[in-house]
């Protein structure tokens, strides 16, 4: 709490400007009227106040708006946003994408803080879904944003928003998240032709089922090893040697370097050694010739 002291003669602020830059904590408290501050919030950003001074200004706004700031003030908070707590932000009703952008700009270059996470959560919940413009904005500021959402939250992303997603936005997504995003991407890109479709869908393939991988193998896509290594193991296992060869094209030679890593290792264990030998890569560990493979999981399903 700042002590209530009278404003020194001649120091009363008539407007929010650079003359306040070196005011002491108590001088700001005594000499700046909260209503004036609220109406001239857009000027605060241009003045290089210290964190301590921003604390005083925040305290003034809190007294003026105990139930939460109006959006007209929020939009112009600028660096004052750095002083807001998640509790403060939960009182807000932010509906404008421009307001969201303005506040994210202040935090640009920094990791996502609890304040930013709360702001985004409030904004998205207010909109009801993660629309394309919002997703565009959020991933521009935080490339990893999409992968920070739970599968349940991702389910509210409309397929049309998937067009805003860049490959790097999915770098930290786990298989559960890609399971949700892949069908949306498939739907979003369904009208594209073969090669263009593959370029767009490639980043999402960690959520693709076996049938889709089989279909891609018929399209000469030449999937790179990095993408192949991110595929779901359970989706890769049923693929035949011929299908994997077609899927990878010239990149098939890379299997040798990855033979001890999943999903390649597990896939090798499911293939006949004869079939693996046809690749000429020296892959070892397949099912020896003459052995019968029983798929017990299929038997259980039938019974």
């Amino acid at each position: 709490e700042v002590e209530k002291t009278a404003c020194p003669s001649g120091k009363k602020a008539r407007e929010i400007d650079e003359s306040l830059i070196f005011y002491k904590k108590w001088e700001l408290e005594a000499c700046v009227d909260a209503a004036l501050l609220a109406t001239q919030m857009d000027r605060v950003n241009a003045i290089p106040f210290t964190y301590e001074q921003l604390d005083v200004l925040k305290h003034k706004l809190d007294e003026l708006y105990p139930q939460g700031y109006p959006e007209s003030v929020i939009q112009h908070l600028g660096y004052l946003f750095l002083k807001m707590s998640p509790e403060d932000i939960r009182k807000w009703n932010v509906t404008s994408l421009e307001t969201l952008k303005a506040l994210l700009e202040v935090n640009k270059g920094h990791e996502m803080s609890p304040q930013v996470a709360t702001l985004i959560d409030r904004f998205v919940k207010g909109r009801g879904q993660l629309d394309k413009d919002t997703l565009d904005t959020l991933t521009a500021f935080y490339p990893g944003y999409l992968c920070s959402l739970s599968p349940e939250e991702l389910s509210s992303v409309p397929p049309s928003s998937i067009w805003a997603v860049r490959p790097q936005d999915l770098d930290t997504c786990d298989p559960r998240q890609l399971d949700v995003l892949y069908p949306k991407a498939r739907l979003a890109f369904q009208n594209m032709n073969g090669s263009e479709y593959f370029v767009k869908i490639q980043s999402f393939l960690g959520g693709a089922p076996t049938e889709d991988l089989k279909a891609l193998s018929q399209q000469n896509v030449s999937m790179d090893l990095a993408t192949f290594m991110k595929l779901r193991t359970d989706a890769v296992l049923p693929l035949t040697v011929a299908e994997v060869q077609k899927l990878l094209g010239p990149h098939v030679e890379g299997l040798k370097a990855e033979e001890r890593h999943r999903p390649v290792r597990d896939w090798i264990l499911r293939q006949r050694q004869d079939d693996l030998d046809t690749l000429g890569l020296g892959l070892q560990g397949g099912i020896p010739n003459g052995y019968l493979v029983l798929d017990l999981s299929m038997q259980e399903a039938l019974s």
Epitope: F22, T50, E52
Partner: antibody, heavy 122, light 106 residues
Framework: EVQLLESGGGLVQPGGSLRLSCAAS????????MSWVRQAPGKGLEWVSA????????YYADSVKGRFTISRDNSKNTLYLQMNSLRAEDTAVYYC???????????????WGRGTLVTVSS | IQLTQSPSSLSASVGDRVTITCRAS??????LAWYQQKPGKAPKLLIY???SLESGVPSRFSGSGSGTDFTLTISSLQPEDFATYYC?????????FGGGTKVEIK
């Protein structure tokens, strides 16, 4: 090239005066608050004074208040420090320094001059 | 706000991991910067906002901390890193610097 160049240092007797200058180039000088920071021989850094971009607001450390005056001429891209009633303890290298950003609470310095030595001695 | 740096000096070898601490007399959130100064030269900004690396500064330098306790770490000391390091708070006026830590060759 972005740089700051101080001048005006030298030997002065106690009670005397000196005016330091700092010529700025390579950035929009008038957009940035500027500071003077000093360093006594073999000692640490001490923030002495600061001035807003327009020159309308100033700040002084208690140790120099009433004796030093900071000013700027934006048309000449130059920062000044007028030092009066100098004392032996004012002996130091004086650096002019540019604030990191034009706005925001970022009061640290990303550009420094090479410094000018002020020696107060009889 | 007073900043206390420790140690005031240390001896280390090339390749060593070096840690310097800075303690503030009151909480300053993450409003702390670190500088490197070599003899006869001006200070050079290394870290701001306690942990953000200034552009062009090698990634072997890192900063951490919040509130009152802060750390500057050099993960693998290089010959050019032998210098004096200062912390500076910018939470409020007057801006203040720590007393410095001199890193010398062992």
């Amino acid at each position: 090239e972005v740089q700051l160049l101080e001048s005006g240092g030298g030997l002065v007797q106690p009670g005397g005066s000196l005016r330091l200058s700092c010529a700025a180039s390579g950035f929009t000088f008038s957009s940035y608050a500027m500071s003077w920071v000093r360093q006594a021989p073999g000692k640490g850094l001490e923030w002495v004074s600061a001035i807003s971009g327009s020159g309308g607001s100033t700040y002084y450390a208690d140790s120099v208040k009433g004796r030093f005056t900071i000013s700027r001429d934006n048309s000449k891209n130059t920062l000044y420090l007028q030092m009066n009633s100098l004392r032996a303890e004012d002996t130091a290298v004086y650096y002019c320094a540019k604030r990191w950003g034009k706005d925001g609470p970022y009061w640290y310095f990303d550009l420094w001059g090479r410094g000018t030595l002020v020696t107060v001695s009889s | 706000i007073q900043l206390t740096q420790s140690p005031s000096s240390l001896s280390a070898s090339v390749g060593d991991r070096v840690t310097i601490t800075c303690r503030a007399s009151q909480g300053i959130s993450s409003a702390l910067a670190w500088y490197q100064q070599k003899p006869g030269k001006a200070p050079k900004l290394l870290i701001y906002d306690a942990s953000s690396l200034e552009s062009g500064v090698p990634s072997r330098f890192s900063g951490s901390g919040s509130g009152t306790d802060f750390t500057l770490t050099i993960s693998s000391l290089q010959p050019e890193d032998f210098a004096t390091y200062y912390c500076q708070q910018f939470n409020n006026y007057p801006l203040t610097f720590g007393g410095g830590t001199k890193v010398e060759i062992k």
